[in-house]
């Protein structure tokens, strides 16, 4: 059967049952995921907006799939095995009375079972297994997976030690409002701004105060963590992402096949081993690549570097440099340059800094 082909998995609680406090629902679901992460290399992150791998839904009757719920009793919940779209999603029958204890139907115990399905497990014939098809209350304080459950899940994902072989370090989510926060790369994607840091990215929708944190691997499983530079050509629905001496092309938010490719295909000399930052200016149809204290200008129409480059950043971008971490283009006249925890709004028509901000100023910090 299907399995998740990545170890960092996101979930989102779409809506909440009125039977329980929201905090109790959050806790029950978080603990249920933890049951499985304790015995596998899998890591689960809750996101509050956007597309999660696993959507948790409370619904009654017909609710958007072929498997309508049946009222109180009978079917308590169901979940879909790993995959895109509805894949992984867990649906809980709102006609049950969901609880934190032995009365009604215990949400934690049911969620452990359903998440087992979300991860690719079928039913077990062992009555002691949480994956046994019928619900039976057990003391949640002493609850343990059975040997059969552990054997099943580890046959799909291995044991927790396999974390050490993951390409992504298990670095925790950076604090968004930490005044010292810096970013690895920033780019617009349509009306959104993507801020990359380690294995995460934040998504900022223009003019909206809310942002959501996501794992890079949850959106683009084939991409590495630690993206170092990014830029968008909106007219082509293309985003270019850079790490080390490689780059990836994303079209309409989908990674293109046959990537990564070498950054040297842009025409960089061999001594360039990585890109610090990049930005595309649609007015000139040029991309600026920032490498250490220099920058190159690339003609996207002719697909070649402009002559006379590299140039010094400090010479041509007054007040910026000598090195930068990230940059993006906005509002038809500004570059936003990021240096450590500071950010500079730069008017490229006036060729000067018009505002100095904290790097995380976009998040209402």
């Amino acid at each position: 059967g299907p399995v998740w082909r990545k170890h960092y998995i996101t979930y989102r609680i779409n809506n909440y049952t009125p039977d329980m406090n929201r905090e109790d629902v959050d806790y029950a679901i978080r603990k249920a995921f933890q049951v499985w992460s304790n015995v596998t290399p899998l890591k689960f992150s809750k996101i509050n907006t956007g597309m999660a791998d696993i959507l948790v839904v409370f619904a009654r009757g017909a609710h958007g799939d072929f498997h309508a719920f049946d009222g109180k009793g009978g079917i308590l919940a169901h979940a879909f095995g790993p995959g895109s779209g509805i894949g992984g999603d867990a649906h809980f029958d709102e006609d049950e009375f969901w609880t934190t204890h032995s009365g009604g139907t215990n949400l934690f115990l049911t969620a452990v079972h359903e998440i087992g399905h979300s991860l690719g497990l079928g039913h077990s014939s062992d009555p002691k297994a949480v994956m046994f098809p019928t619900y039976k209350y057990v003391d949640i304080n002493t609850f343990r997976l059975s040997a059969d459950d552990i054997r099943g899940i580890q046959s799909l994902y291995g044991d927790p030690k396999e974390n050490q072989r993951l390409p992504n370090p298990d670095n925790s989510e950076p604090a968004l409002c930490d005044p010292n926060l810096s970013f690895d790369a920033v780019t617009t994607v349509g009306n959104k701004i993507f801020f990359f840091k380690d294995r995460f990215f934040w998504l900022k929708v223009s003019e909206r105060p809310k942002t959501s944190v996501n794992l890079i691997s949850s959106l683009w499983p084939t991409l590495p963590s630690g993206i170092e530079a990014a830029y968008e050509i909106e007219a082509r629905n293309q985003v270019f992402l850079f790490k080390d001496d490689k780059y990836w092309l994303i079209s309409n938010l989908r990674p293109e096949p046959n990537y990564p490719k070498s950054i040297h295909s842009f025409g960089f000399p061999n001594f360039v081993k990585k890109i610090d930052a990049a930005v595309f200016n649609p007015r000139f149809y040029r991309t600026y690549f920032f490498v250490d204290n220099q920058y190159w200008r690339y003609d996207e129409r002719r697909q070649m570097m402009d002559p006379g480059y590299p140039k010094l950043i400090t010479k041509n971008f007054q007040g910026i440099g000598p090195k930068i971490d990230a940059v993006f283009y906005s509002k038809n006249k500004y570059y936003y340059f990021f240096q450590g925890s500071n950010q500079f709004e730069y008017d490229f028509l006036l060729q000067r800094i018009t505002k100095t901000l904290k790097s995380n100023s976009w998040f209402g910090c």
Epitope: N14, G64, F66, H78, F80, G81, G83, G85, I86, D89
Partner: antibody
Framework: EVQLLESGGGLVQPGGSLRLSCAAS????????MHWVRQAPGKGLEWVSG????????IYADSVKGRFTISRDNSKNTLYLQMNSLRAEDTAVYYC???????????????WGRGTLVTVSS | DIQMTQSPSSLSASVGDRVTITCRAN??????LNWYQQKPGKAPELLIY???SLQSGVPSRFSGSGSGTDFTLTISSLQPEDFATYYC?????FGQGTKLEIK
Amino acid sequence: EVQLLESGGGLVQPGGSLRLSCAASGFTFSWYWMHWVRQAPGKGLEWVSGIVSSGGTTIYADSVKGRFTISRDNSKNTLYLQMNSLRAEDTAVYYCAKDIRGAYSSGLFDHWGRGTLVTVSS
Amino acid sequence: DIQMTQSPSSLSASVGDRVTITCRANQSIYTYLNWYQQKPGKAPELLIYAASSLQSGVPSRFSGSGSGTDFTLTISSLQPEDFATYYCQQAGIFGQGTKLEIK
């Protein structure tokens, strides 16, 4: 390459019966839900019936419940639709469609056959 | 029961036009919505699944958006081969279809 080939359509009188078949190839048939979807002449698409990968669960549209029976033979990679008590309003092209999932149906049909025409008329 | 309402039922447009077709559910279906294209005498083909994911091999001029009850299919720049009928679908419910014709 996934291929679905329907057969068994034809002209039948009201009240009569017909059995449609769908021969599948190019994928592991026994792993996936399969469905029948129909389209009356000049009309839109109407889902008819679906069956789980193992054959143990079947679901039907209200319009055909009690008259049509879906089944499958995983050893022959074949899906069937037994249609009894046929009515004029059952006249349609019947398509066989592959779901992308096995345990629960996603309702997402990623491959379709070319269809077979069933005409119910006296 | 869930119902899907698709609009418009027919639409005339020219090559190069941007076209939007909408589909509305009478209750939340999260992002469980798919779009299909059907040409005369042919079987339907999957274009977009899970509201916004482009099926492999489908040109990038097609895009989908929406969640909950309101969904859209957009063709950014119509090509001659795009004139066809489009259906939204959620599980066993199809929209009534939108016939896209040449102006």
